[in-house]
Amino acid sequence: MAFSGSQAPYLSPAVPFSGTIQGGLQDGLQITVNGTVLSSSGTRFAVNFQTGFSGNDIAFHFNPRFEDGGYVVCNTRQNGSWGPEERKTHMPFQKGMPFDLCFLVQSSDFKVMVNGILFVQYFHRVPFHRVDTISVNGSVQLSYISFQNPRTVPVQPAFSTVPFSQPVCFPPRPRGRRQKPPGVWPANPAPITQTVIHTVQSAPGQMFSTPAIPPMMYPHPAYPMPFITTILGGLYPSKSILLSGTVLPSAQRFHINLCSGNHIAFHLNPRFDENAVVRNTQIDNSWGSEERSLPRKMPFVRGQSFSVWILCEAHCLKVAVDGQHLFEYYHRLRNLPTINRLEVGGDIQLTHVQT
């Protein structure tokens, strides 16, 4: 089975949402839906894995209902007709609270993890490879939907590549009902290794600059800063690193460093005091020459949320901010697997890190 690099996530999509699953569902694909159940309106939400956008053919309908003490309905819809419901009479979601919902596609079933615990197993009633779309509707606000392919060496890309000069990676903040597939960086036929998602969020509504509901505070803080984590397996062509957060209102600077031992292979340093995004490499405590050129205005704004996607390729790192390609940084340290540590510091609040 051919796999490509993991599909870029949908960030903060408006609900109701429909988005393409590039390459369709495949055995081993893991899809994470991260969001917050709205406390104000509605008693239901649903995540659907379906064929096309019509909603007539839904291979897996996952439907939590805050009714009759709370339960979750799982079902399949074929040619507009629903099959028999499977009900789980325990409710792992709480109104007004964020959740982490993970779907693992396997040959015989979907396995669903909610908040770190296996919640339900739903056996396929129709062939899962027909599914090419994920939709979400109901009483929920979404932070992101992310995709992770299994560790497999692809034979060929599972979807056609898009020239990198086009707007890339994440779709823009959705305003409409239906999401077309986002432009993506070319898929590299390289092994996909473990992705680690570290998620902590103190104010889900503040993850992006246009929250659907007022910010809500929760009794757990955001990432400790500076934040340091290991990049398992180091860098390699096709490796992606995703970060999102909010710039502090009084921010001067922050940095994202990709490190190799005592060296900083890539130093990404937005400077609000200079209105610049500085890139550099430090080897043996000596900085190289700075790169500052940008194709557009400074993408980071004090007090506003942001996403950064770093894609490693053979010769360079490609960096996108808020869904738009920003720059390329050609490797100065070329032993990519030794670049295995991420360090983030400065005047931001992190809300999501995926390595």
Epitope: Q30, H90, P98, M113, V114, L118, V200
Partner: antibody, heavy 124, light 109 residues
Framework: EVQLVESGGGLVQPGGSLRLSCAAS????????IHWVRQAPGKGLEWVAY????????SYADSVKGRFTISADTSKNTAYLQMNSLRAEDTAVYYC?????????????????WGQGTLVTVSS | DIQMTQSPSSLSASVGDRVTITCRAS??????VAWYQQKPGKAPKLLIY???SLYSGVPSRFSGSRSGTDFTLTISSLQPEDFATYYC???????????FGQGTKVEIK
Amino acid sequence: EVQLVESGGGLVQPGGSLRLSCAASGFTVSSSSIHWVRQAPGKGLEWVAYIYPYSGYTSYADSVKGRFTISADTSKNTAYLQMNSLRAEDTAVYYCARYSTYSSSKWVWGMDYWGQGTLVTVSS
Amino acid sequence: DIQMTQSPSSLSASVGDRVTITCRASQSVSSAVAWYQQKPGKAPKLLIYSASSLYSGVPSRFSGSRSGTDFTLTISSLQPEDFATYYCQQSYYDSNPITFGQGTKVEIK
């Protein structure tokens, strides 16, 4: 190296309170669920509670519901178990454990790291 | 609640013996079953996760299997350091998302 270290156990009278801490190192508690499991003297393992720090989601065994509160401070990389209205039957060694759900491209349905345990004795 | 009924509660065996411990879940728990080894005064150690996957660093004489709601831990050739208490545990979301079996004490014959 991943490590969990519990503290806060001790002798307390029935009706009293204790707060147990579970300090984590080598990983961020925000990327896993953290569970408390207890073991009464000479008995088996009993699950007590868990927290999924990202979402703040918590769940409790019926035997402690309404009396115990689990929480986490991700800035300190520490989980806590606040135990109120303690009873003699709460006497046990309390362990915290990491329930790791995804590792090396495989789901890990198991508690892969445990602390050394802290003894709570409820007696008058 | 999902109950995990573990048997036997204790057994006596000799070094080199093949030992089998079973756990039966009261309802489907998918593959969300783990096995632990615990020695007196020590914390449990993970042996098997996801019903049949050997945890890293655990000797290959330990294995796990699943048949429906029946789960088995097998020690193919018992070693002196294997004398301990073994627990199964399920983590399939229910009113109690985690439950343990009662434990099996493996003693020297």
